[in-house]
Amino acid sequence: FPQDRPFEDTCHGNPSHYYDKAVRRCCYRCPMGLFPTQQCPQRPTDCRKQCEPDYYLDEADRCTACVTCSRDDLVEKTPCAWNSSRVCECRPGMFCSTSAVNSCARCFFHSVCPAGMIVKFPGTAQKNTVCEPASPGVSPACASPENCKEPSSGTIPQAKPTPVSPATSSASTMPVRGGTRLAQEAASKLTRAPDSPSSVGRPSSDPGLSPTQPCPEGSGDCRKQCEPDYYLDEAGRCTACVSCSRDDLVEKTPCAWNSSRTCECRPGMICATSATNSCARCVPYPICAAETVTKPQDMAEKDTTFEAPPLGTQPDCNPTPENGEAPASTSPTQSLLVDSQASKTLPIPTSAPVALSSTGK
């Protein structure tokens, strides 16, 4: 089209723009390493950093790993997008008891309202079932239809929860079981006997609890016994031990009857953000042994930025380019500023001997 020619010509003399025939207009040329957010970018703000698959660009313009929903009790709510993380939620029939960023750290099965109570609000992915006392005239044993039926095949019968009485409300929520395959299998073997005075065949109200063993003769060891991978917490509840299954974690102490497993970052890494009994974010230890550092003389007085290397690698201990900028990286690890200025040293703790100091002692 002849009328388009002048527009095309205006682009040729401008290296920061190009002509897009499909849309018949001048477009802004994104700088190397940046990618357009639309077909024909008009300005620098229409360009963005491109992250690797399963990473997204966070508010601080950093490529950050999307959370994974690979646990059995989680499902994907929203996918990993270029500018937002994947979001996970508890699978149907479960609710989140301990939330985590864009996910849930711990899911429990929804409670079934016990005799004398009816469902006030059904459970959701975020909230447990809320029960309230049945209206007068309803038989307590059949206050809710579920309590008058044997579980049909294909459904997971729930453990009868211990009622909770909040001070401010007559309604109550009752967590039932830990959200693991183990818990599901255990739950499927249980049946409720709402009217039976005996506790035989009735599951414990604690998540992860298995029936207590009778005391061995002459033994005082009659403690509550939790299922494998659960421990008895200070409040006497069976609680799931943390898992060290992430690639960057190793087991520090095992799951015991009265204490959780604890995890730590594998050797060569340091915990940048902790979590209960574990580390939420491990990063490669960002400082090289003093004797491996090479520093050109013209950089002796400069601050240098090192990017912590991706998981599974060690810092290469070489300074970054002359401008002191770290190379762009899509690694989720945190970058750390290095100041080359030498200073006096503190001594080593007797309880923690370390490698040679820079003095060679």
Partner: nanobody, 122 residues
Framework: EVQLVESGGGLVQPGGSLRLSCAAS????????MAWYRQAPGKGCELVSI???????YYTDSVKGRFTISRDNSKNTLYLQMNSLRAEDTAVYYC????????????????WGQGTTVTVSS
């Protein structure tokens, strides 16, 4: 036994400055790396900065250019100079010896000292 005592915290307005100190005792001759960690209310323990035995220093992105870590062997003391403070810097700050060895688990807050509280609020 290694003992660390943190001090210097307080209430400061956004944009203000504080200097934290960590007095160390129970050490032998040479200098390990030392670290500052912090724990905000309801959050996990977070690495802030490391200083190596030979004085090289490391900072997390969020404090880069605002905080300065230093050490003085003659006084057996570690410092953290905090400038341009923000509300998100509100936390209890802890120092930790030899983080390469001691801070692989999520337990580098409160293991050696009681910490010092920094509150940034207008």
């Amino acid at each position: 036994e290694v003992q660390l005592v943190e001090s210097g915290g307080g209430l400061v307005q956004p944009g203000g400055s504080l200097r934290l100190s960590c007095a160390a005792s129970g050490f032998t001759d040479d200098g390990p790396d030392m670290a500052w960690y912090r724990q905000a209310p309801g959050k996990g323990c977070e690495l802030v900065s490391i200083i190596s035995a030979d004085g090289r220093t490391y900072y997390t992105d969020s404090v880069k250019g605002r905080f300065t870590i230093s050490r003085d062997n003659s006084k057996n003391t570690l410092y953290l100079q905090m400038n341009s403070l923000r509300a998100e810097d509100t936390a209890v700050y802890y120092c930790a010896p030899d983080p390469r060895r001691n801070c692989r688990g999520g337990d580098c807050c409160g293991n050696w000292g009681q910490g010092t509280t920094v509150t940034v609020s207008s």
